[in-house]
Interface confidence: low
Amino acid sequence: GSTVPPMVNVTRSEASEGNITVTCRASSFYPRNIILTWRQDGVSLSHDTQQWGDVLPDGNGTYQTWVATRICRGEEQRFTCYMEHSGNHSTHPVPSGNSHHHHHHHH
């Protein structure tokens, strides 16, 4: 089939005192090969500080997955979610505290 670029959605949730969990979800993409990782100051975080979901079919012939990490509140601007799919790539910031969703359909 033809390439379908992912929708990328970054959310944040309270984790513990002074920390938040940031989650980057990629959905509705095809083919299933994708790179999704958190970066800090432009460098990918080590694997042991991130948690990945499986790349799963979403029932529409496309796929979805996610990656999450825990960061210190106040340092959100240093973190971005990096996505690479079918030769295209994009970076997605952590939303500010009063805006919990960030959607980006990558073309």
């Epitope: 790179i35 100051d41 432009g42 460098v43 990918s44 975080l45 210190c72 240093r78 690479e84």
Partner: antibody
Framework: DVHLVESGGGLVQPGGSRKLSCAAS????????MNWVRQAPEKGLEWVAY????????YYADTVKGRFTISRDNPKNTLFLQMTSLRSEDTAMYYC????????????WGQGTLVTVSA | QIVLTQSPAFKSSSLGERVTMTCTAS???????LHWYQQKPGSSPKLWIY???NLASGVPARFSGSGSGTSYSLTISTMEAEDAATYYC?????????FGSGTKVEIK
């Protein structure tokens, strides 16, 4: 203009210690990751260590892990490399480099400071 | 760790000649994490090509970079005297970050 000036090099005996410094100017130091890269005489480049802007993500080359410590003092715009248990193979020019946060890569380099490990 | 193998190690080229050097990674890396540096004797290295194919500021248009997966290359379309230098590829796809061993380009 961005300037990175390394200091602290010199002659050290095997097993000895040395602390290198890198004074940064011309940019907002506390928002950039920094690295040390070294080059042995007539040899290629070897990445040594990386520290992010907040000092909470640090990576080392396998060859220096457990012996070298990278750190930074953001208010003083200074990067450090504490080297212990030095070996002859640590003899090299040590460069301080600034990380490019958007594209990656080392966009700025200092002039280097030479560390010679010899009896 | 990801090992970067550069070839040739040494290249003697005539002025005006097309020069191509390669950088092969021991495992697949993202093209966003592959860069090239130029170094001349007695000087610090300079970022030359970033994210596989983008020329750094001030780099002449005769330089180009390409590649994906495990295979990357730097090409000088028409060799000029000022291009004589050593070129290193570098990856930060995964820590520890690594450099290739370099390709030294000289004028024939």
């Amino acid at each position: 203009d961005v300037h990175l000036v390394e200091s602290g090099g010199g002659l050290v005996q095997p097993g000895g210690s040395r602390k290198l410094s890198c004074a940064a100017s011309g940019f907002t130091f506390n928002t950039f990751g920094m690295n040390w890269v070294r080059q042995a005489p007539e040899k290629g480049l070897e990445w040594v260590a990386y520290i992010n802007s907040g000092s909470n993500t640090i990576y080392y080359a396998d060859t220096v892990k457990g012996r070298f410590t990278i750190s930074r003092d953001n208010p003083k715009n200074t990067l450090f490399l504490q080297m212990t248990s030095l070996r002859s193979e640590d003899t090299a020019m040590y460069y301080c480099t600034r990380w490019e946060p958007v594209t990656g890569g080392f966009s700025y380099w200092g002039q280097g400071t030479l560390v010679t490990v010899s009896a | 760790q990801i090992v970067l193998t550069q070839s040739p190690a040494f290249k003697s080229s005539s002025l005006g000649e097309r020069v191509t050097m390669t950088c092969t990674a021991s495992s697949s890396i993202s093209s966003s994490y592959l860069h090239w540096y130029q170094q001349k004797p007695g000087s610090s290295p300079k970022l030359w090509i970033y994210t596989t194919s983008n020329l750094a500021s001030g780099v002449p248009a005769r330089f180009s970079g390409s590649g994906s997966g495990t295979s990357y290359s730097l090409t000088i379309s028409t060799m000029e005297a000022e291009d004589a230098a050593t070129y290193y590829c570098h990856q930060h796809h995964r820590s520890p970050f690594t450099f290739g061993s370099g390709t030294k380009v000289e004028i024939k």
